[in-house]
Amino acid sequence: MSSKYPRSVRRCLPLWALTLEAALILLFYFFTHYDASLEDQKGLVASYQVGQDLTVMAAIGLGFLTSSFRRHSWSSVAFNLFMLALGVQWAILLDGFLSQFPSGKVVITLFSIRLATMSALSVLISVDAVLGKVNLAQLVVMVLVEVTALGNLRMVISNIFNTDYHMNMMHIYVFAAYFGLSVAWCLPKPLPEGTEDKDQTATIPSLSAMLGALFLWMFWPSFNSALLRSPIERKNAVFNTYYAVAVSVVTAISGSSLAHPQGKISKTYVHSAVLAGGVAVGTSCHLIPSPWLAMVLGLVAGLISVGGAKYLPGCCNRVLGIPHSSIMGYNFSLLGLLGEIIYIVLLVLDTVGAGNGMIGFQVLLSIGELSLAIVIALMSGLLTGLLLNLKIWKAPHEAKYFDDQVFWKFPHLAVGF
């Protein structure tokens, strides 16, 4: 017979999730209100479009990108949506409490929803390293801890390093990657005999993962430009991100072919590498003055991504227990670092050009920011991993990793796995 959702989780998940949702509703009731001063409805719609782009990226883009497992595609998409919905609610409250609360109530604007969606995106990037090995109750814990850690990191960076919204949010790539990798490191690693086929990709799910990659590819310029201060900066960011992702697609497909002995193209490489340019230019997307520089960065990012996809999965599989097709974690960790390094290089070039000690100090501050993001990601990731290992969450048995039937009702299936 088909495998049931474990009884304990059936008791634990609805109680845990619904209690949390009730708590969030109460917090919203007592502490939030809408921005009443918006007078221009047309402007409101224009502002909403950016938030809509981010939601599409999160729900469809990252949802489908992680759905390439043969027997875990349903869970990947739906669990992503669940985490996004929960993450956005908690992120709105947390950002409000951290930045506005002394003035009384948290004012919810379209900008706060935009910010919250980006914070929730962090979880969706991280979770790629653990999807298939955890249940929904554990994912709720992961959402709460990661959104809280990212919110606090951004607040600390803003206040200590005098960093604006865009710059502190662009640490999301590095933060999410290292958070996910450290959580994965804490979870039970070995895939028992007989389950090796489950973490393999299949044609239909791989196609849906490619669909996810396409959505991300289309909307990445919106992500990189969403928090910038002025239209001039946003325009520059959109152009540069577009050039970078365009070149990284060409590089990814040709590089993937080059990396294969028979010149064949790997689906897994392409899923991930098409986004490489967008991640790499993220931090400095508004600062790059000309298309050729963005294109060079897209090329370098594409090559690094393909190289990483070729040589890192073996290591990640052994050490962290991450399946070969879940390459977002190490891909983003490499490319996020590349993006941060590019920004630091720009500051170093300033120092060389101006011979100015103050700019040298800016370089040190940027290195400090990056280090802090990595340290907080690793520490909060390890904490989350330890929490997820607690017996109360009734984690799926290793033999039931990467299996939709553990979580979903499939009436048409007569036989279990």
């Epitope: 007078e39 502002s47 900008f111 935009r114 002025s230 900066e233 508004h286």
Partner: antibody
Framework: QVQLVESGGGVVQPGRSLRLSCAAS????????MHWVRQAPGKGLEWVAV????????YYADSVKGRFTISRDNSKNTLYLQMNSLRAEDTAVYYC??????????????????????WGQGTTVTVSS | EIVLTQSPATLSVSPGERATLSCRAS??????LAWYQQKPGQAPRLLIY???TRATGVPARFSGSGSGTEFSLTISSLQSEDFAVYYC???????????FGPGTKLDIK
Amino acid sequence: QVQLVESGGGVVQPGRSLRLSCAASGFTFSSYAMHWVRQAPGKGLEWVAVISYDGSNKYYADSVKGRFTISRDNSKNTLYLQMNSLRAEDTAVYYCARESTLYSSSWYRRYYYYSMDVWGQGTTVTVSS
Amino acid sequence: EIVLTQSPATLSVSPGERATLSCRASQSVTSNLAWYQQKPGQAPRLLIYGASTRATGVPARFSGSGSGTEFSLTISSLQSEDFAVYYCQQYNNWPPIFTFGPGTKLDIK
């Protein structure tokens, strides 16, 4: 030509409210962040509030936080400042100003600078019992 | 919060002479500093942005310099219309607000 015209000033008692308006013309209003800056009699300039070009972000000086609300209507090319719980120390000439994002470039990088390049003539607010 | 200090509070200079006004920030503002001129009964006017770039229509006799915490505005040869109050202003990344200096009054000697 590019112009900002403030209105709505006047004499008001402490604790009462007043709403200032700033009508913009000669430029694409919806592409610029806008500010309110005030100047008490015989004193220097004091920044009051800013609103982003799309109205999604607002920031205030500590001295007015919780009492003043900045807003804009891009369809009417108008900026507003709603002033509640007015105090004697709010007496000043209130200017609205356009924020410009100017930039310079080297071969490898752009530098952005934020300043106020267009100012209105100001409207006087007197808070007195 | 970054505080701007301007010196001197009042500067008396003869027409045709050179005047140098100073602005100091309590912490680094990189090059995000602007200078404004305000004449009695008028609104301020932008002179310099990015510490050293002249705004449109500003005469070449006005020049700005400095970065980090020390900035100056120099008027190479004072004209009668230059006697006014000058304010420096910085933009802060976080929170994204503006701060003005207390001003320097430029008087005819």
